[in-house]
């Protein structure tokens, strides 16, 4: 069935939001820990799969919704269920920074998926 009617966030908008929430921040969401994920296995859904479990943190809600919109798109960049590193937990800010680094790389190489 059709995806939701929305101008899906662009990679550039996602990068801007990730920069916005990480700049000058030592921590996010009171240091909450999330499962580390393999961002190469469908980066939007993979990141969302980990971040979906974070609540009571307004700082990342916009990021969560952006990832959800991108993950919901069909054909999607990452409808594939990601493999979570169930033995590795990292801070939310670290995951967000990892995502930012990865997304910037994708953006630079023009592989918007």
């Amino acid at each position: 069935s059709p995806s939701p009617v929305t101008p899906s966030p662009t990679l550039k908008e996602l990068i801007e939001e990730l920069v916005n929430i990480t700049q000058n921040q030592a921590s996010l969401c009171n240091g909450s820990m999330v499962w580390s994920v393999n961002l190469t296995a469908g980066m939007y859904c993979a990141a969302l799969e980990s971040l979906i479990n974070v609540s009571d943190c307004s700082a990342i809600q916009r990021t969560q919704r952006m990832l959800k919109a991108l993950c919901s798109q069909k054909p999607a960049a990452g409808q594939i269920s990601s493999e979570r590193s169930r033995d590795t937990k990292i801070e939310v800010i670290q995951l967000v920074k990892n995502l930012l680094t990865y997304v910037r790389g994708v953006y630079r190489h023009g592989n918007f998926r």
């Epitope: 799969e49 809600q61 959800k68 919901s72």
Partner: antibody
């Protein structure tokens, strides 16, 4: 305390439009989206879409394609839902809601606005 | 769209008993599942988010469980005030979708 107060009941003619307002208080309006959900008489809940007052970004349910417009007025902390080309199937209570604790889980709801379509 | 299949559609429970409501999704939701209750003439009320987390003020008689596609809401020691229609909500993907609802009434 988070509060959402909606405009009163509306009776509109088929083919016309309706605009429902949702005035918020008790939190920073631009921090969280406003979601809209409707409920036809005796039926379940149907998600219409949301607007992020921070940047005006919207996501709509495909079922309401081209007929719904969500807007937000930061100066009055009020969100609006306009539905056009109304038909009998649009008779419902329309709710606005916001999500603070868990993203996209509507936890604070307005009292609802009954929209009746009748000639 | 993700389809949420809620069962049963109605449930009659004696006070003090346990009520169980099931919600099955057409695809994995990870942990993006919430529960609401709606009383006649009222707006829906929040109960549980992220499968098993109770909102403040929700009695511990309400518990949520499950993962992936299968989820359950349990109401133990049912009281008169627990009557109403219960809905599940998936918030893993847009559009957000609700179950059809389960009407809980007292015997």
């Amino acid at each position: 305390e988070v509060q959402l107060v909606q405009s009163g009941a509306e009776v509109v003619k088929p083919g016309a439009s309706v605009k429902v307002s949702c005035k918020t208080s008790g939190y920073s309006f631009t921090d969280y989206p406003i979601y809209w959900v409707r409920q036809a008489p005796g039926a379940g809940l149907e998600w219409i879409g949301y607007i992020d007052p921070y940047n005006g970004g919207t996501t709509y349910n495909q079922n309401f394609k081209d007929r719904v417009t969500l807007t937000a007025d930061k100066s009055t902390s009020t969100a609006y839902m306009e539905l056009s080309s109304l038909r009998a199937g649009d008779i419902a209570v329309y709710y606005c809601a916001t999500a603070v604790v868990a993203t996209d889980v509507m936890e604070n709801w307005g009292q609802g606005t009954l929209v009746t379509v009748s000639s | 769209d993700i389809v949420m299949t809620q069962t049963p559609l109605s449930l009659s429970v004696s006070p003090g008993e346990t009520a169980s409501i099931s919600c099955k999704a057409s695809q994995s939701l990870r942990s993006a599942l919430a529960w609401f209750r709606q009383k006649p003439g009222q707006s829906p009320q929040r109960l549980i988010y992220l499968v098993s987390n109770r909102y403040p003020g929700v009695p511990d008689r309400f518990s949520g469980s499950g993962s992936g596609t299968d989820f359950t809401l349990r109401i133990s020691r049912v009281e008169a005030e627990d009557t109403g229609v219960y809905y599940c909500l998936q918030h893993w993907q847009f559009p957000l979708t609700f179950g059809a609802g389960t009407k809980v009434e007292l015997k």
